[in-house]
């Protein structure tokens, strides 16, 4: 029978015929930077080619002995995970391995460094086709690490990275808290996060999604037909790798933009339990479980957007969060949000010739996040447009005047410390979906998108008495772009995206005494791209 | 992540001193800042990457470790460069002592340095 | 469905050797670790020991220096050897696998999930 | 080698009641403990693994808890199909170690 992590990770589709095609990932070469490896167990003989590069520190101990089967134990599991006969993932992939971690798993930044940049010389030397780097090993935070990841990943190298098994945020250790970087978490066959003894799976907005770490039969360095169970989540971004080298076989001219999407899109959503992770990363944790596309081949039609969680600002009074998308990402909206309530809102600016999203503490506020929705949007022509405070009653709107300019998300910015409670009288007037409508004491910012076939609706969801959560999803076929709240009042902590939902959040209604007239709606922006649709069908 | 290193726990120190004479004051208005891991037993003192500005040639390297080992000896400081770094990354692997970190700090192309760390198997 | 069975003489004469095989069915033996247990009339459960199919071996202190388990992998078998028994071995023996796995943090660990399938116990009587 | 001691050896309840056994271990082995109930003739069989992880098909009234030193098996509601012996065993180190066993019988 298919061990249950190789069933968690395969489409329905698949399982009543056979697990996968037999060559997946054969276009593919997985660089493994870990421990020796035992390349002649049954599993991994001849897909694993062992590389001369060994930069590892000595054993811990006088007394330690090195022996094969303990040196080799590590990455002979993580290569059969990825590539094994019987239970890899991507079984027609390629491997070459790096020795950066010695017989007693542990290893150096400085070594590993090494290791990377060898992997970009011999990809300058003797270029092929896609690869993907596994680095299944974490250390403390290092901006030297995450650099050379971000080098790598910009000459257009997949890195994927365990998140840490240290049951901490994934951000406080590298390589998983490096942005280019495809950070993975670890759940069992429960999809519950894994946890055994003290540790137990990272989380956080540096983890982009999970996928099975717990009790994974692969091959063991015991012998050469031996197996063994190993958990962790080394063991959840080898998955995370073949399924990678999958798409990658199946669609080599993927980016690393369009791959993390397409990760995102086709995995499990929200099954993951998150009473599991503290209260205050709940919110910025995925609950994505990755999983292999329903077919090899085609999901270019669609817009692929995810949702991007700044660091936390900091409590000081003008302190800022800023999110950001990746190089070949279209930042489309921006909203923000704070547990204590007390924001300035947020609003879209360009850095360095590209948009970011930046969220604005408010006095006595205990910080505050950018949320950034970012999405792959060929051939885009975005621009923020803003208005000031109206001071009207009417409350403030900006539109999109362009020609073809949709909106694709609204933003609110506002100077004073309190808004007071505001209900425009009428959200959207008919015939004017591309305006944005806030407060009349609050600047408002609409992103104003041009792009083949692009269309976009808005979509609201009021409910008359305060609620402590509200929510609004674009229908099948359509994806969020933006999702904002109206009133920006103050007891609204504040909206951002989780997958193709809109969640607005406003503070326990029992403790503000809130009344009718602050009723909040979540509005979404849903978007589809005509062109996308036409130039797949016309490729089918 | 970001530009938010300063947002974790690793310890930032920009060290501006007078100028040492022997060196050449990096760039007006910038100071190379020096880093090192969060977790104490994960540190490893006496390595550290020097990392230098973006567009800094392996010939440019390569005399920027020379010098540092030039101007440690002067001090009486062993140093060995263990690794020239480029292709990813403009710099070099030093070992050395930490008194020299200051020193180091101040030559030109020096971005940061950061003390080397320990990785696990995970 | 994984399934155990014991097999061996029911009966073992005083300072001879106690042997028994344990037979695995719809699983492979070549990834989890199995054990024998003994449990004497009326009373509580004794660990013996595991052995790993890689022939790794582990056993009970109380017991070491009269005890080995073996491996036969084409079998699917493993077996228990106890010399110089004496009536207090008399036992119902059991074999049972122990599912562990390992995760590192800055060490390796190893962690069991117990032993989640037994098999359905023999009785030796150590007897003249 | 780690002791487990367990209480009570012997319980009299009814069906319906609830249920709890406690298990001792001698040193912290953190939540590294299983649960095994056996009935008269039969092999043991898996309830819990680490303190309160409930065994695959294990119904739902039985709940395990503790860590450290001290662990305690809770059936909610007792059914006729429980009467039987309860044992612990540490999974922290070899050799594996058992308590002696609670047996509980029908009032």
């Known amino acids: 029978s298919i061990p249950w992590n190789l069933e968690r990770i395969t489409p329905p589709r698949y399982r009543a015929d056979e697990y996968q095609p037999p060559d997946g990932g054969s276009l593919v070469e997985v660089y493994l930077l870990d421990t020796s490896i035992q390349s002649d167990h049954r599993e991994i003989e001849g897909r694993v080619m062992v590389t001369d590069f060994e930069n590892v520190p000595e054993e811990d101990g006088t007394r330690f002995h090195r022996q094969a089967s303990k040196c080799d134990s590590h990455g002979t599991h993580l290569a059969g995970v990825v590539s094994g006969r019987d239970a890899g993932v991507a079984k027609g992939a390629s491997m070459r391995s790096l020795r950066v971690l010695n017989c007693q798993g542990k290893g150096t930044v400085s070594g590993t460094l090494i290791g990377l940049e060898f992997i970009r010389k011999s990809q300058l030397v003797q270029p092929v086709g896609p690869l993907v780097v596994l680095l299944p090993l974490a250390g403390g935070y290092s901006r030297v690490l995450n650099a050379a990841c971000q080098r790598l990943a910009r000459a257009g190298v997949v890195l994927v990275t365990a998140a840490g098994n240290f049951r901490d945020d994934a951000c406080l250790y590298s390589p998983a808290s490096a942005p280019e970087v495809i950070t993975v978490g670890a759940t069992n066959a429960q999809d519950q996060p894994v946890t055994l003894g003290t540790l137990g799976t990272n989380f956080g907005r540096c983890v982009d999604l999970f996928a099975p770490g717990e009790d994974i039969i692969g091959a063991s360095s015991d012998c050469s037909t031996c197996f063994v169970s190993q958990s962790g989540t080394s063991q959840a971004a080898a998955h995370v790798a073949g399924i990678a080298a999958m798409m990658l076989s199946a669609e080599p001219e993927l980016t690393l933009a369009e791959l993390r999407q397409r990760l995102i899109h086709f995995s499990a959503k929200d099954v993951i339990n998150e009473a599991w992770f503290p209260e205050d990363q709940r919110v910025l944790t995925p609950n994505l479980v990755a999983a292999l596309p329903p077919s090899t081949h085609g999901a270019g039609w669609q817009l692929f957007c995810r949702t991007v969680w700044s660091a936390h600002s900091g409590p000081t009074r003008m302190a800022t969060a800023i999110a950001r998308c990746a190089p070949d990402e279209e930042l489309l909206s921006c909203s923000s949000f704070s547990r204590s309530g007390k924001r300035r809102g947020e609003r879209m600016e360009a850095q360095g010739g590209k948009l970011v999203c930046r969220a604005h503490n408010a006095f006595g506020g205990e910080g505050v996040y950018a949320i950034a929705r970012c999405c792959l949007l060929p051939q885009a022509n975005c621009s923020v447009h803003t208005a000031p405070p109206a001071e009207a009653s009417m409350g403030t709107r900006v539109h999109c005047h362009q020609q073809g300019h949709v909106l694709t998300g609204c933003s609110s910015h506002w100077e004073v410390e309190d808004l007071g409670t505001h209900k425009p009288p009428v959200l959207r007037p008919r015939g004017q979906p591309n305006q944005c409508v806030g407060h009349r004491e609050a600047s408002i910012h609409a992103s104003c998108c041009h792009a083949p076939g692009l269309e976009c609706k808005v979509k609201e969801h009021g409910i008359p008495a305060p609620q402590e959560q509200v929510t609004v999803a674009c229908e099948e076929g359509w994806t969020l772009t933006g999702c904002s709240a109206l009133p920006g009042t103050s007891h609204v902590l504040g909206a951002y995206a989780v997958d193709n939902t809109c969640v607005v959040r406003s503070r326990d209604v029992s403790t503000t005494g809130s009344t009718s007239e602050e009723a909040v709606t979540a509005v979404a922006i849903c978007c589809r791209s005509r062109h996308l649709a036409q130039a797949s069908q016309e490729l089918q | 992540q970001e530009d938010e290193d300063g947002d974790y726990e690793e310890l930032v120190l920009a060290l501006r001193s007078e100028e040492d004479g022997l060196a050449e004051a990096p760039e007006h208005g910038t100071t190379a800042t020096f880093h090192r891991c969060a977790k104490d037993p994960w540190r490893l003192p006496g390595t550290y990457v020097v990392v230098l500005k973006e567009e800094t040639h392996l010939s440019q390297s390569e005399r920027t470790a020379r010098r540092l080992q030039a101007q440690a000896a002067r001090r009486g400081y062993l140093t060995k460069i263990l690794h020239v770094f480029h292709g990813l990354l403009p710099g070099f692997l030093v070992k050395m002592s930490g008194d020299l970190l200051e020193l180091a700090l101040k030559l030109p192309h020096v971005d940061y340095i950061e003390e080397d760390s320990s990785v696990f198997a995970q | 469905q994984v399934q155990l069975q014991e097999s061996g003489p029911g009966l073992v004469k005083p300072s001879e050797t106690l042997s028994l095989t344990c037979t695995v069915s719809g699983d492979s033996i070549n990834t989890y670790y199995w054990s024998w247990f003994r449990q004497p009339p009326g009373k509580g459960l004794e660990w013996i020991g595991y052995?790993?199919?890689?022939?790794?071996?582990n056993y009970n202190p109380s017991l070491k220096s009269r005890v080995t388990i073996s491996i036969d992998t084409p079998r699917n078998q493993f077996s228990l050897k106890l010399i110089s028994v004496t009536a207090a071995d008399t036992a119902v023996y059991y074999c049972?696998?122990?599912?562990?796995?390992?995760?590192?943090?800055?060490?390796?660990?190893?962690?069991?999930?117990?032993?989640?399938?037994w098999g359905q116990g023999t009785t030796v009587t150590v007897s003249s | 080698d780690i002791q487990m001691t367990q209480s009570p050896s012997f319980l009299s309840a009814s069906v319906g009641d609830r249920v709890t056994i406690t298990c001792w271990a001698s040193q912290d082995i953190s939540s590294y403990l299983a649960w095994y109930q056996q009935k008269p003739g039969i092999a043991p069989k898996l309830l819990i693994y680490a303190a309160s992880t409930l065994q695959s098909g294990v119904p739902s009234r039985f709940g395990g808890s503790g860590s450290g030193t001290e662990f305690t098996l809770t059936i909610s509601s007792l059914q006729p199909e429980d009467f039987a012996t309860y044992y612990c065993?540490?999974?922290?180190?070899?050799?594996?170690?058992f308590g002696q066993g609670t047996k509980v019988e029908i009032k």
């Open positions: 065993q540490q999974l922290n180190s070899y050799p594996r170690t």
């Open positions: 052995i790993y199919y890689s022939g790794t071996t």
């Open positions: 049972a696998r122990e599912r562990i796995t390992m995760i590192r943090g800055v060490t390796l660990y190893y962690y069991s999930y117990g032993m989640d399938v």
